[in-house]
């Protein structure tokens, strides 16, 4: 998920020379940027997170903060440094007048400044009637490993840690960073202050109603008695976790963030840093019945973002709102009428609903998976969560039409066995942000650092696109889709897989002169074809050209329209084998699909031919979907015939390694 998302405001304050010697200009002449929450009521003007460039040392951060104070004082402004960040992000939190922003943006080392904003607990209601605890028969949910090797950090309200359901399972840290409660007559009732956090701790690790009954937890208080916190408080909490991890390294860590605020560049950046330090972060998608990409930390790509479904696997409605959705959601989990510990009394239970509860379920599942396989990386864990999810059970009609294709139809489930999934070739589909409608607009989809991009496709609702291609960016392959003139924008769709010891490269064939079409194959010894992409510069790709058919017996090559350049993703990995599977329909149809068989994993999905009435191709779980324009607009010419091309792979090496372990 990228910074081009949604209504996020980026205010670049141009450097003006009205006041000479105001401050040194930033190095390299780059302009630091100012960001603030797009949701006005959530803004907290007067408090700012000043983020410094990545390699800035603590001493430089302190010096920059002092410099700001000194220069502000010379102009008659009082400032207060509330916190100096180090360990996760370099920077500082400052209380100052907004008049000083221009000054602050010119300080050395400053990368960007973000105005503080509110974050909120993502559960409702907080005070339903007490209900009796659930009854579990002995033969029901008794997991073999309850997550005992894993520590789950909970950033939430205060919690009643000696509730019977969680006593001894939760260590309350001394961390507290919360804003004052709103309203002059607010009455701080302890049981209400503890309500949200106690319930979630119970959902994660409760003795009788918990998912990971063996997991130990640590709680940090970042939400006040009204369930409200700040981005800055959450950042300081994440920094506290990172410092704790460095001081006393333990086993796998899961961080549960059952909160949401508006899109925040700095909160997403902090989550990214913590994830790259080996911590698994799980967050609520948000309860705003909106695109999760407009909220943080839900929009951070490194975080596992969880939407909420009910007992019927339908998206949860919460009053007039409901669960968030969209490409920034990784999966859904139970989030309606979830029974958990109630802070009303030490033996009470209560039902709460929301994406917080859904995230707590996934945090519990993650704890159990990590306890069974402590060496799992974040990418491996995410892929397993997706793999073991219930597929295609959510009624997508609940989501806005334009979000249906982007929203994963996955409901989290515990693996049938916490061991033995290692032989699988795991892949997932990653959608880019929308490119926007301009003629040269592009969209980029990226895989996680330890995933391989095995194929790249594109999709446009208008059909006006110029295909896609895989290209190197920062030493890693990315998937870039191109909009066409008059198009409403495109999506890039990356197929991201776990392929240990893989060596992948892209082979390109320029547009062919001959009428046979363009073709490219994997010529290196031991390399197999995992995906095909095509990209063209012409606005309309030969609408009346006859379709190109793949020559028989040549599975290791990509073919395409003669006016397009064709890109083949070729990979070498121990024991990797792939095959091409096609499904063509002679009559025009809005959707053509082809699926990989049991034991094979879909790595590539593309359409033949790549003509302009094809809206695009994308993978849904193990099925390749090719979408075309409404049949009524295409007529039934030969142009209407579309073939979905799937590339299905498996790894004999992974299968053998798994058998040897067993």
């Amino acid at each position: 998920q990228e910074d081009e998302d949604g209504d996020y405001e980026e205010l670049v304050l141009a450097l003006r020379s009205e006041e000479d010697g105001l401050a040194e200009a930033p190095e390299h002449g780059t302009t630091a940027t100012f960001h603030r929450c797009a949701k006005d009521p959530w803004r907290l003007p007067g408090t700012y997170v000043v983020v410094l460039k990545e390699e800035t040392h603590l001493s430089q951060s302190e010096r920059t903060a002092r410099r700001l104070q000194a220069q502000a004082a010379r102009r008659g402004y009082l400032t207060k440094i509330l916190h100096v960040f180090h360990g996760l992000l370099p920077g500082f939190l400052v209380k100052m007048s907004g008049d000083l922003l221009e000054l602050a943006l010119k300080l050395p080392h400053v990368d960007y400044i973000e105005e503080d904003s509110s974050v909120f607990a993502q559960s409702i209601p907080w005070n339903l009637e007490r209900i009796t605890p659930p009854r579990y028969r002995a033969d029901e949910y008794q997991p073999p490993d309850g997550g005992s090797l894993v520590e789950v950090y909970l950033l939430d309200t205060s919690i009643q840690s000696d509730h019977r359901e969680i006593e001894g399972r939760v260590m309350v840290t001394d961390f507290e960073n919360v804003p004052e409660e709103d309203g002059t007559r607010f009455h701080r009732q302890a049981s209400k202050c503890d309500s949200h956090g106690t319930h979630l701790a119970g959902v994660v690790s409760g003795r009788d109603a918990g998912v990971a009954k063996g997991a130990s937890m640590r709680s940090l208080r970042v939400l006040n008695c009204q369930g409200k916190g700040t981005v800055s408080g959450t950042l300081i909490g994440l920094e506290f976790i990172r410092k704790s991890q460095l001081v006393q390294p333990v086993g796998p860590l899961v961080v549960l963030l059952p909160l949401a605020g508006g899109y925040s560049r700095v909160l997403n950046a902090a989550c990214q840093r913590l994830a790259r330090a080996g911590v698994v972060l799980v967050t609520a998608a948000g309860n705003f019945r909106d695109d999760a990409c407009l909220y943080s930390p839900a929009s951070a790509p490194e975080v596992i973002t969880v939407g909420a479904t009910n007992a019927q696997d339908q998206p949860v409605t919460l009053g007039t709102l409901g669960t968030n959705f969209g490409r920034c959601v990784d999966l859904f989990a139970p989030g309606e009428d979830i029974i958990g510990a109630s802070s009303d009394c030490s033996t009470c239970f209560v039902s709460q609903s929301g994406t917080s509860q859904a995230a707590a379920h996934v945090a519990g599942i993650a704890a159990m998976m990590l306890s069974a396989e402590p060496e799992l990386t974040l990418a491996e864990l995410r892929q397993r969560l997706i793999h073991f999810s219930a597929k295609d059970v959510i009624n997508e009609a609940w989501f806005p039409e334009d979000q249906r294709v982007l929203t994963p139809n996955l409901v989290a489930a515990l693996p049938p066995s916490t061991h033995g999934a290692g032989w699988q070739l795991f892949c997932r589909t990653v959608w880019s942000a929308h490119s926007g409608p301009t003629r040269m607009a592009t969209a980029v989809a990226r895989c996680a650092p330890d995933e391989e991009l095995l194929s790249c496709s594109s999709f446009s609702r208008s059909g006006k696109r110029r295909g896609e291609r895989m290209e190197a960016q920062g030493g890693k392959l990315v998937c870039r889709a191109h909009n066409a003139f008059g198009g409403e924008g495109v999506y890039a769709i990356a197929r991201c897989c776990l392929l240990p010891q893989a060596n992948c490269s892209v082979h390109t064939a320029p547009p062919a002169e001959a009428s046979m079409g363009t073709r490219v194959h994997c010529h290196q010894q031991g390399h197999v074809l995992t995906g095909c992409s095509s990209h063209w510069e012409v606005e309309d790709l030969g609408t009346h050209k006859p379709p190109v058919l793949r020559p028989r017996g040549q599975p290791n090559q990509c073919v395409g329209h003669r006016e397009a350049s064709i890109h083949a993703s070729c990979c070498h990995a121990p024991g990797l084998e792939c095959k091409v599977k096609e499904h063509g329909i002679p009559a025009p149809q809005e959707q053509v699909t082809v699926a990989c068989e049991e034991g094979w994993t879909l790595t590539g999905c593309s359409a033949l031919p790549g003509t302009s009435h094809v809206l695009g191709a994308y993978a849904v779980d193990n099925t390749c979907v090719v979408r075309s324009r409404d049949v009524s607009t295409t007529g039934s010419t030969s142009e209407g015939a579309v073939t979905a091309v799937a590339i299905c792979c498996r790894s004999r090496h992974l299968a053998q390694a798994s058998q040897e372990l067993q």
Epitope: D162, E167, G168, M171
Partner: antibody, heavy 115, light 109 residues
């Protein structure tokens, strides 16, 4: 190490009150409450109630409700159990134990109610 | 609160295995994962041997094991030793409180 240390034996007359203390050490106090359990001579164990070291909330067994008061002094990490209107059948060894899970027990305090 | 039902006594020879049962209702044993077993030697406080049906605290011999089926929990002691001779009590959560069994005297013959 985790320890619960109780006050010494008491002899009381019927109708009087007794207050037994239990000092906790070696663990994060607020992560567990304290349960009180008694055992009459030659008899089984009887759960009397629980107090939160976190917020002082209590949960008393029906049988002793109205006669028992449990309190906590966080400054000294000490929990108290007071039983009023003592009767001869209140003669027992009184134990404090950590939490509802009762994984650690005090050494016991013998309370004898005799006229 | 009526006590959970335990046999008054069981006995076994050294090296043998014995099982003590603890029967309740679906409002206590059957409804919760929180059944515990305690060992008590004369004049000593009870000692936790099994918690949450089948988990052993650290330091407790793996000769002690717990299980549950429906409304009945069981404690099994294998390879009986002389020092195992003691009273054994089970306990369970109820909706608002705790309940104990009446206790079982284990005699090692």
């Amino acid at each position: 190490q985790v320890q619960l240390v109780q006050s010494g034996a008491e002899v009381k007359k019927p109708g009087a009150s007794v207050k037994v203390s239990c000092k906790a050490s070696g663990y994060a106090l607020t992560s567990y409450g304290i349960s009180w359990v008694r055992q009459a001579p030659g008899q089984g164990l009887e759960w009397m109630g629980w107090i939160s070291a976190y917020n002082g909330n209590t949960n008393y067994a029906q049988k002793v409700q109205g006669r028992v008061t449990m309190t906590t002094d966080t400054s000294t990490s000490t929990v108290y159990m007071e039983l009023r209107s003592l009767r001869s059948d209140d003669t027992a060894v009184y134990y404090c134990a950590r939490g509802y899970g009762m994984d650690v027990w005090g050494q016991g305090t013998t309370v004898t109610v005799s006229s | 609160q009526s006590a959970l039902t335990q046999p008054a006594s069981v006995s076994g020879s050294p090296g043998q295995s014995i099982t003590i049962s603890c029967t309740g209702t679906n409002s206590d044993v059957g409804g919760y994962n929180s059944v515990s077993w305690y060992q008590q030697h004369p004049g000593k406080p009870p000692k936790l041997m099994i918690y949450e049906v089948s988990n052993r605290p650290s330091g407790i011999s793996n000769r002690f094991s717990g299980s549950k089926s429906g409304n009945t929990a069981s404690l099994t002691i294998s390879g009986l030793q002389a020092e195992d001779e003691a009273d054994y009590f089970c306990s369970s959560y109820t909706s608002t409180s705790m309940v104990f069994g009446g206790g079982t005297k284990l005699t090692v013959l």
